[in-house]
């Protein structure tokens, strides 16, 4: 039960998060103007990864996107990549573990596989959460240095007669929407590994042990988390699941986890 | 058609105030911002501050802060402006001017409202 | 504040003649964010309020004859009036739409022959 709600919480969670890393990917205030100890301005600049955009005193905004690619700044693009990165990894791993999830039924799927496909999917949101928290932290670096280095022109760059308005621009909300999501997408990440270990039976290093009773056959496994009634298919001892108790022959021919400790 | 109404004029004692409206019609009062600009005569204009009715947000010129005090009444759509503490210095001709959507420029004007500071 | 500085503070014309007037600013008025230049040009004939000519510097405001055309980036702006008319006697103002305290200039005073 308790595995079943990590799981379904870490994929929720995940979920919130994805889509905060898509919203913030597609907003548009990465960047706003900054209006703090700034002369005041009739108009608000703000940018985001795929436009700026400008809005008047009376409420009129005006949006231009970026139609160059070579023209634009690589670490720019470079975030623009791991935002990417990260919303591609985080919908596959979405896809995946729908199919992972422990109250979804798909077919005669084993636990083994699902436990498999939890693991997988948790691993692509952590990555997916960390490209989001490293795209927005780029991006974030990059408007700290800006920032700094147009606070000194203005300044420093008062010699001449003309005055130039400095537009300087801090953190926009896309910011912390991509934090926010790339922490969720990577928490639930983790959820959903932490989910896996329960799934995934523990190996044992007990050997099976079988009782052929007169009637039908008992297998009577200690470690195990299941014993197989001689009724129908498992009658020869057949491991029940992966990573569960094995017949005393297959414990023989597979070395445990156990062994190497 | 936007349309701005202001009285003709107003003839003020020193030391007294007076509140000029400018009336708008035909367009959404609210959505825009309702300007002030002061006029002497040998002189240029000086804009001295605008309202932007949906909010009451205001932006006055830190020239007449203290002097001048705008309102709107969006029931009636008119805006106002107060003046105080008058001298001869703001006998003037007053304009309200309601600025465009799509940029930060006055699009239309009012016929200004002259007014006379004299004992 | 941003001063605007007029120049020539009047001039005196024959219709049919090519006139430029000149605006410039303390401070550049170009936003970054949009490549715009906040500058307005307003006439204002005699007895009457100012009217909107030009706005962003170089974009005219519909009704207004084509004859009117605004130029200039940055600190320096102009206004030329192709071929002036009988009906242009008037004082023409630049105006600072980009840094509060909005201001303006002190007018050019157009006079025909």
């Known amino acids: 039960m308790a595995v079943t709600a990590c799981q379904g919480l870490g994929f929720v969670v995940s979920l919130i998060g994805i889509a905060g890393i898509i919203a913030a990917t597609c907003m548009d205030q990465w960047s706003t103007q900054d209006l703090y100890n700034n002369p005041v301005t009739a108009v608000f600049n703000y940018q985001g990864l795929w436009r700026s955009c400008v809005r008047e005193s009376s409420g009129f905004t005006e949006c231009r996107g970026y139609f160059t690619l070579l023209g634009l700044p690589a670490m720019l693009q470079a975030v623009r990549a791991l935002m990417i990165v990260g919303i591609v990894l985080g919908a596959i791993g979405l896809l995946v573990s729908i199919f992972a999830l422990k109250c979804i039924r798909i077919g005669s799927m084993e636990d083994s596989a699902k436990a498999n496909m939890t693991l997988t999917s948790g691993i692509m949101f952590i990555v997916s959460g960390l490209c989001a928290i490293a795209g927005v932290s780029v991006f974030a670096n990059m408007l700290v240095t800006n920032f700094w280095m147009s606070t000194a022109n203005m300044y420093t760059g008062m010699g001449g007669m003309v005055q130039t308005v400095q537009t300087r621009y801090t953190f926009g909300a896309a910011l912390f929407v991509g934090w926010v999501a790339g922490g969720l997408t990577l928490i639930g990440g983790v959820m959903m590994c932490i989910a896996c270990r329960g799934l995934a039976p523990e190996e044992t290093n007990y050997k099976a042990v079988s009782y052929h009773a007169s009637g039908h056959s008992v297998a009577y496994k200690p470690g195990g988390f299941k014993a197989s009634t001689g009724f129908g298919s498992n009658t020869k001892n057949k491991k029940i699941y992966d990573g569960g108790a094995r017949t005393e022959d297959e414990v023989q021919s597979y070395p445990s986890k156990h062994d190497y400790v | 058609q936007v349309q701005l109404q202001q009285p003709g004029a107003e003839l003020v004692k020193p030391g007294a105030s007076v509140k000029v409206s400018c009336k708008a019609s035909?367009?959404?009062?609210?959505?825009?911002?309702m300007h002030w600009v002061k006029k002497r005569p040998g002189q240029g204009l000086e804009w001295i501050g605008g309202?932007?009715?949906?909010?009451?947000?205001?932006n006055y010129n830190h020239k007449f802060k203290g002097k001048a005090t705008l309102t709107v009444d969006k029931a009636s759509n008119t805006a106002y402006m107060q003046l105080s503490s008058l001298t001869s210095e703001d006998s003037a001709v007053y304009y309200c001017?309601?600025?465009?959507?799509?940029?930060?420029?006055?699009?239309?004007w009012g016929q200004g409202t002259v007014v006379t500071v004299s004992a | 504040d941003i001063v605007m500085t007029q120049s020539p503070s009047s001039l005196t014309v024959t219709p049919g003649e090519k006139v430029t007037m000149n605006c410039k600013s303390s401070?550049?008025?170009?936003?970054?964010?949009?490549?715009?230049?906040?500058v307005t040009w307003y006439q204002q004939k005699p007895g009457q309020p100012p009217k909107l000519l030009m706005f962003?510097?170089?974009t005219r405001e519909s009704g207004v004859p084509d004859r009117f055309t605004g130029s200039g980036s940055g600190t320096d702006f102009t206004l030329i009036i192709s071929s002036v008319q009988a009906e242009d006697l008037a004082v023409y103002h630049c105006?600072?739409?980009?840094?509060?305290?909005?201001?303006f200039g002190s007018g050019t005073k157009l006079e025909i022959k």
């Open positions: 001017a309601m600025g465009a959507y799509y940029s930060n420029s006055f699009a239309y």
């Open positions: 035909g367009s959404t009062f609210t959505t825009y911002w």
């Open positions: 309202i932007r009715p949906f909010d009451s947000n205001t």
């Open positions: 401070q550049s008025l170009l936003n970054s964010g949009n490549q715009k230049n906040y």
């Open positions: 962003w510097a170089s």
């Open positions: 105006q600072n739409d980009y840094v509060y305290p909005f201001t």
